[in-house]
């Protein structure tokens, strides 16, 4: 069977640029989603964000985030998600396991899911960028 090559070394600055792009796109997505009035966030949904037992950028739960955003894309035709997915794929290893998401069926609950996950994704990218920049500062001190 096919084996992957040595894991490519990327300058941390390049990874930071990917996360900066994701942070910007997450804000665009949230702004778009928030235009829907009368929808409240739900406590029933949690987007995995950072793993405490890995170093940046491998601490970002990119495969799970991708699965959640792909679900939103299927529920609501947000084209910005296509670009988000392309950038998340820059952080996901080809051998990463798949994540299954249970999708709400009720229309209003779908809207709550979309708002909640979009909000958490935006917050997650803020945290991811902080973890990257603080990690880079620690590496230079």
């Amino acid at each position: 069977s096919h084996t992957l090559p040595v894991r490519l070394l990327r300058p941390s600055d390049d990874v930071q640029k990917i996360v900066e792009e994701l942070q910007s796109l997450s804000k665009m997505l949230l702004k778009d989603v928030e235009e829907e009035k009368g929808v409240l966030v739900s406590q029933n949904y949690t987007l995995p964000c950072l793993s405490p037992d890995a170093q940046p950028p491998n601490n970002i739960h990119s495969p799970a985030i991708r699965a959640y955003l792909k679900t939103i894309r299927q529920l609501d035709n947000k084209s910005v998600i296509d670009e988000i997915i392309e950038h998340l794929d820059k952080l996901i290893f080809q051998d990463a396991p798949e994540t299954n998401i249970s999708v709400p069926t009720d229309t209003h609950e779908c809207k709550r899911f979309i708002l909640t996950i979009s909000q958490q994704f935006s917050e997650c990218m803020d945290l991811a960028l902080k973890s990257l920049t603080s990690g880079a500062q620690q590496a230079t001190t």
Epitope: K17, D89, K90, Q94
Partner: antibody, heavy 122, light 107 residues
Framework: QVQLVQSGAEVKKPGSSVKVSCKAS????????MQWVRQAPGQGLEWMGA????????RYSQKFKGRVTITADKSTSTAYMELSSLRSEDTAVYYC???????????????WGQGTTVTVSS | AIQMTQSPSSLSASVGDRVTITCRAS??????LAWYQQKPGKVPKLLIY???TSASGVPSRFSGSRSGTDYTLTISSLQPEDVATYYC?????????FGGGTKVEIK
Amino acid sequence: QVQLVQSGAEVKKPGSSVKVSCKASGYTRTRYWMQWVRQAPGQGLEWMGAIYPGEGDTRYSQKFKGRVTITADKSTSTAYMELSSLRSEDTAVYYCAFPEGPYAAPYGMHYWGQGTTVTVSS
Amino acid sequence: AIQMTQSPSSLSASVGDRVTITCRASRNIHNYLAWYQQKPGKVPKLLIYYAKTSASGVPSRFSGSRSGTDYTLTISSLQPEDVATYYCQHFWKTPWTFGGGTKVEIK
């Protein structure tokens, strides 16, 4: 040994459609993007679109949107590119290609099919 | 869409010469660039990926570098077998456009 084998040459009438296949072997990953590229006689490489075979997620060049459909059959590890409303300027060699990794997003396309010549003529 | 402007479109150099081909991206693509070699009637072959990483089996005379949004493919000592057309392609976001190509010939 990773291999991409494409279907054979086609001669088509203007206005008809063509469907080119690309079968991958020796590759076990599903998290990757495969691309389709074409090259008209004496011209450069032109990106048409891409597919994420694991999910059937697609991206298309604006130039071909509405005329091209890229699909994949996971069970046979085969990708397909269908181009409709053919015209003489679609006469070209069509290639499929995909990356080695290690990430789901490509850095470059390591593996290429042998190319499929499509001739559009009345 | 991100535009890739490749120059020159053709060049002629002597065996042993140092040859450089440049691709300029219309926006920052953060090293997500590949270089391919295509010989007449043949399939494109990956030379360089991630701007400066050599693909397996590529001779050491081929190298890639970056300065801002300018990406360069250098052939340190041109050989007769290097006669081909060279293309760049970016992978920052779709569409993954190609440069127009550079045809390299021997004087």
